[in-house]
């Protein structure tokens, strides 16, 4: 479970077609 103080930070993961991009790479979203 994520710590409460972390909740407003973006979480970054590897994914494909994410973050408005066509290729695979890191994507950080709140």
């Amino acid at each position: 479970r994520r710590r409460r103080r972390d909740t407003h930070f973006p979480i970054c993961i590897f994914c494909c077609g994410c973050c408005h991009r066509s290729k695979c790479g890191m994507c950080c979203k709140t």
Partner: antibody, heavy 121, light 106 residues
């Protein structure tokens, strides 16, 4: 100016521990993901670990998982690498590197000067 | 997974140097390139396949498709002599670097 300065390297015996530090200046440290990358003498680059914005959002290379711990103290603008159960193959220059700004931080845009870690009996 | 680079590339001053990086489905990932001069730390020269960070000369360019990413240095200068490393993400826990290519400017 933007700067990363590593410290804490040295000679250590196999099985022992060492903690590296990376002091950041010239940018808003808390707004960037931070990496550790190492380079064995005369060899190529090897990614070690990354810590993103949240303390819980961190990843490790298989070669160090369970032995190394990456952490950050945003109040001190400092990145850390706690290295336990060190092996001879961990001998390398250890660089801290800043992840690119933005929602898609694929590259390492700022690098420190590196600190040498030698694991030897 | 692994990224494969030629160990060395030689070029005459003013000519074009081409450094390749090969890996499984590399063209489906974003490739970055780093320059490392002897005794110095790496410097980012290309990211997201084709983009140049501010301060990097226009003679550096990149491409990436299929299984191969390419770094091209046009009008190569003596100061470009260095090791060059490609890099790409294959998962959240697998960031790969190529073995490096030593560029010699003859």
């Amino acid at each position: 100016q933007v700067q990363l300065v590593e410290s804490g390297g040295g000679v250590v015996q196999p099985g022992r521990s060492l903690r590296l530090s990376c002091a950041a200046s010239g940018f808003t440290f808390s707004s960037y993901g931070m990496h550790w990358v190492r380079q064995a003498p005369g060899k190529g680059l090897e990614w070690v670990a990354v810590i993103w914005y949240a303390e819980s959002n961190k990843y490790y290379a298989d070669s160090v998982k369970g032995r190394f711990t990456i952490s950050r103290d945003n109040s001190k603008n400092t990145l850390y690498l706690q290295m336990n159960s060190l092996r001879a193959e961990d001998t390398a220059v250890y660089y801290c590197a800043r992840a690119q700004e933005g929602i898609a931080p694929d590259a390492f845009d700022i690098w420190g000067q590196g600190t040498m870690v030698t694991v030897s009996s | 997974y692994e990224l494969t680079q030629p160990p060395s590339v030689s070029v005459s001053p003013g000519q074009t140097a081409t450094i390749t990086c090969s890996g499984d489905k590399l063209g489906e990932r974003y490739a970055s390139w780093y320059q490392q001069r002897p005794g110095q730390s790496p410097v980012l020269v290309i990211y997201q396949d084709i983009k140049r960070p501010s301060g990097i000369p226009e003679r550096f360019s990149g491409s990436n498709s299929g299984n191969t990413a390419t770094l091209t240095i046009s009008g190569t200068q003596a100061m470009d002599e260095a090791d060059y490393f490609c890099q790409a993400w294959y998962s959240s826990t697998n960031v790969l670097f190529g073995g490096g290519t030593k560029l010699t400017v003859l």
